[in-house]
């Protein structure tokens, strides 16, 4: 019988030779389960693993803890890959992450984290950064120390609020802290003075909804 | 839509005193806090006051106690600045911002910078010499 390839990342994909940015097949190691998710073989050297990405709208973020465990939407599109392949994937080896933005007037922006990864369910998919650098700010616009997820099901964030019900999305909330990529998605010219928009603040400041995000994530040593 | 409209700033004297106002539209001031701001030449925004609750909580920074009053009129949806004993250290834009008044972390009383997401566009505020 011939051995199955399966990939865990979309380094490996890379490095397999094929190199053509799209969505491919990932599957963890010992694990049956696989994920689609968009690989963007270009930006930076490539083998980039695309865990997020807003970009018109199309797609509903207000979703619940079970749906942002298991990922939505549309890898081609609008989608979250989900906390529960990422948690595992980011502790098995080291990864890095890249928050890739867009704003209305035509500007882009990143943040590059040298160190990520996503604690357990147990733990609420809890996010752990280190060491930020990148054009999107000199202050990291996600809370540090990293704090819990939260959706609108789920409530763990250190609001006497409920951040991810206040400000639309699954998100690791502060009370509720300097972004939300995970927003209410504004057209432009209703971008400005927003209360739940895509917010990143070290960047754009305050009320800002940005044009287009993507969150994407890459073995350190590659 | 959500605006913030300030006014009442010009250019005043040394000791003189000056009632700012913003103006709010969009939403209703019983479920938001507002703050104001100002921004001087070259300088970051920094806090002046704040308040929510009706008035039942207001705060204000070390610089301007005893000096500044905040208040608000929730029937015409208006906060106020009143700024006596002006200095010429107080020259700067003053900014009115909003953000929902639950947005608190536990056991703290007040709302970090990035935290107010609608800003008016300022008035400006001159204290001479």
């Known amino acids: 019988k011939e051995e199955q390839i399966s990939f865990r990342d979309c380094a490996e994909v890379f490095k397999s030779g094929h190199t053509t940015n799209g969505v491919y097949t990932l599957t963890l190691p010992n694990s049956t389960e696989e994920v689609k998710a968009y690989c963007d073989m270009e930006a930076g050297g490539g083998g980039w693993t695309i865990i997020q990405r807003r970009e018109d709208g199309s797609v509903d973020f207000q979703r619940t803890w079970k749906e942002y465990k298991v990922g939505f939407g549309n890898p081609s599109g609008e989608y979250w890959l989900g906390n529960e392949f990422v948690s595992q994937l980011t502790n098995q080896q080291r990864y890095v992450l890249k928050i890739h933005l867009k704003d209305w007037e035509g500007n882009e922006a990143y943040s590059l984290y040298e160190h990520f990864y996503l604690s357990s369910e147990e733990l609420n998919y809890r996010i752990h950064l280190k060491g930020l650098t990148g054009t999107a700010g000199k202050i990291s616009s996600i809370s540090q120390p990293g704090n819990d997820f939260s959706t609108k099901d789920a409530d763990n964030d250190k609001c006497i609020c409920k951040c991810s019900q206040m400000l639309t999305g699954g998100w690791w909330f502060d009370a509720c802290g300097p972004s939300n990529l995970n927003g209410m998605y504004y057209p432009q010219r209703q971008n400005t003075n927003k209360f739940n928009g895509i917010k990143w603040y070290y960047w754009k400041g305050s009320g800002y909804s940005l044009k287009g995000t993507t969150m994407m994530i890459r073995p350190a040593d590659f | 839509e959500v605006q913030l409209v300030e006014s009442g700033g010009g250019l005043v004297q040394a000791g003189g005193s000056l009632r700012l106002s913003c103006a709010a539209s969009?939403?209703?001031?019983?479920?938001?806090?507002i703050g104001w701001f100002r921004q001087a030449p070259g300088k970051e925004r920094e806090g002046v006051s704040s308040?929510?609750?009706?008035?039942?909580?207001?705060y204000y920074a070390d610089s301007v106690k005893g000096r500044f009053t905040i208040s608000s009129d929730n029937d015409k949806n208006t906060v106020y600045l009143q700024m006596n004993s002006l200095k010429p250290e107080d020259t700067a834009v003053y900014y009115c911002?909003?953000?929902?008044?639950?947005?608190?972390?536990?056991?703290?009383?007040?709302?970090?910078?990035?935290?107010?997401?609608?800003w008016g566009q300022g008035t400006l505020v001159t204290v001479s010499s």
């Open positions: 969009g939403f209703t001031l019983d479920d938001y806090a």
């Open positions: 911002a909003a953000v929902p008044a639950g947005r608190l972390r536990f056991g703290e009383q007040w709302y970090p910078l990035y935290e107010y997401d609608a």
């Open positions: 308040i929510r609750d009706n008035g039942g909580s207001t």
